[in-house]
Interface confidence: medium
């Protein structure tokens, strides 16, 4: 069986300030079991943007119903974009663990750039 791949098809996305940004992410398999998370940046200093399992992310909505059986689409939309949102976003699959989930595989990243709002 092929190992799961995390696919972020867009290398970059450009959005005008005030608009919503859609960041696409898809998995190639349902296995292993475990949540996905979105981060801005990589390494130790990365910032958690969305956690499928828990959290409060009012500006983030999922494009598809993540709890739906056999769902492989983990794209998100971030509303009301500001310049502070610019950066590279990574979709990361975690493997269910005890007590903590373990990072399994990351997408290649999508760079979000923010344009000035047209006057």
């Amino acid at each position: 069986e092929d190992e799961l791949q995390v696919i972020q098809p867009e290398k970059s996305v450009s959005v005008a300030a005030g608009e919503s940004a859609t960041l696409r992410c898809a998995m190639t398999s349902l296995i292993p079991v475990g949540p996905i998370m979105w981060f801005r940046g990589a390494g130790a200093g990365r910032e958690l943007i969305y956690n499928q399992k828990e959290g409060h992310f009012p500006r983030v909505t999922t494009v598809s119903e993540l709890t739906k059986r056999n769902n492989l689409d983990f794209s998100i939309s971030i509303s009301n974009i500001t310049p502070a949102d610019a950066g590279t976003y990574y979709c990361v699959k975690f493997r269910k663990g005890s007590p903590d989930d373990v990072e399994f595989k990351s997408g290649a990243g999508t760079e979000l750039s923010v344009r000035a709002k047209p006057s």
Partner: antibody, heavy 119, light 108 residues
Framework: DVQLVESGGGVVRPGESLRLSCAAS????????MNWVRQAPGEGLEWVSR????????DYADSVKGRFTISRDNSKNTLYLQMNSLRAEDTAVYYC????????????WGLGAPVTVSS | ETVLTQSPATLSVSPGERATLSCRAS??????LAWHQQKPGQAPRLLIY???NRATGIPDRFSGSGSGTDFTLTISSLQTEDSAVYYC??????????FGGGTKVEIK
């Protein structure tokens, strides 16, 4: 009810260290970014540092960069600020503040912990 | 870095009258502006977020308006308990999060 209670403030000499704590209750601490904001005697509010909900992403004001370290223990619902190489100009009341979203306003504030740096 | 300038520095208003506070940003901050109230010896408290939305439990005599670079906090009928310093805060560009210098509202 959301409660943020700071502790660990006190009087120290220049060059010494101090560690502030902020005990959080009344909300899902692990789901929110947290901040430290300070207020020097008779002055306005100055943002000091921020940490994202997972603890990976941190930011600092230029005035404290390299001297202060923000951290959190989500299992203890506690936010910390380790302050090293303290200077007279660090004298202030230090407030912890909960952030509504990862890129958003501060919706709840602690009561504050006074820090005095004096020889 | 975005600078927030508040005016006036001090505002003296009689009870029941209207108080109008201004916050001007050095560059656009969209609608990403909050107002906080700080009474003497107390911690700040959120009043308004996203320029015009009242926070939970805030009386409707407080209202916010504006977008881009010019913002206003209005207290429609000043009460004695509204004596405080009011700070604006932007969260459009960060870090750092920036606060204005504050406006002190005194009761005449």
């Amino acid at each position: 009810d959301v409660q943020l209670v700071e502790s660990g403030g006190g009087v120290v000499r220049p060059g010494e260290s101090l560690r502030l704590s902020c005990a959080a209750s009344g909300f899902s601490f692990r789901s929110y970014a947290m901040n430290w904001v300070r207020q020097a005697p008779g002055e306005g509010l100055e943002w000091v540092s921020r940490i994202d909900s997972g603890g990976g992403g941190t930011d600092y004001a230029d005035s404290v960069k390299g001297r202060f370290t923000i951290s959190r223990d989500n299992s203890k619902n506690t936010l910390y600020l380790q302050m090293n190489s303290l200077r007279a100009e660090d004298t202030a009341v230090y407030y912890c503040a909960k952030q509504y979203d990862w890129n958003s306003f501060f919706d709840y504030w602690g009561l504050g912990a006074p820090v005095t740096v004096s020889s | 870095e975005t600078v927030l300038t508040q005016s006036p520095a001090t505002l003296s208003v009689s009870p029941g009258e209207r108080a109008t506070l201004s916050c001007r940003a050095s560059q656009t901050v969209g609608s990403k502006l909050a107002w906080h109230q700080q009474k003497p010896g107390q911690a700040p408290r959120l009043l308004i977020y996203d320029a015009s939305n009242r926070a939970t439990g805030i009386p409707d005599r407080f209202s916010g308006s504006g977008s881009g670079t010019d913002f206003t906090l209005t207290i429609s009928s000043l009460q004695t308990e509204d004596s405080a310093v009011y700070y604006c805060q932007q969260y459009y560009y960060w870090p750092p999060y920036r606060f204005g210098g504050g406006t002190k509202v005194e009761i005449k």
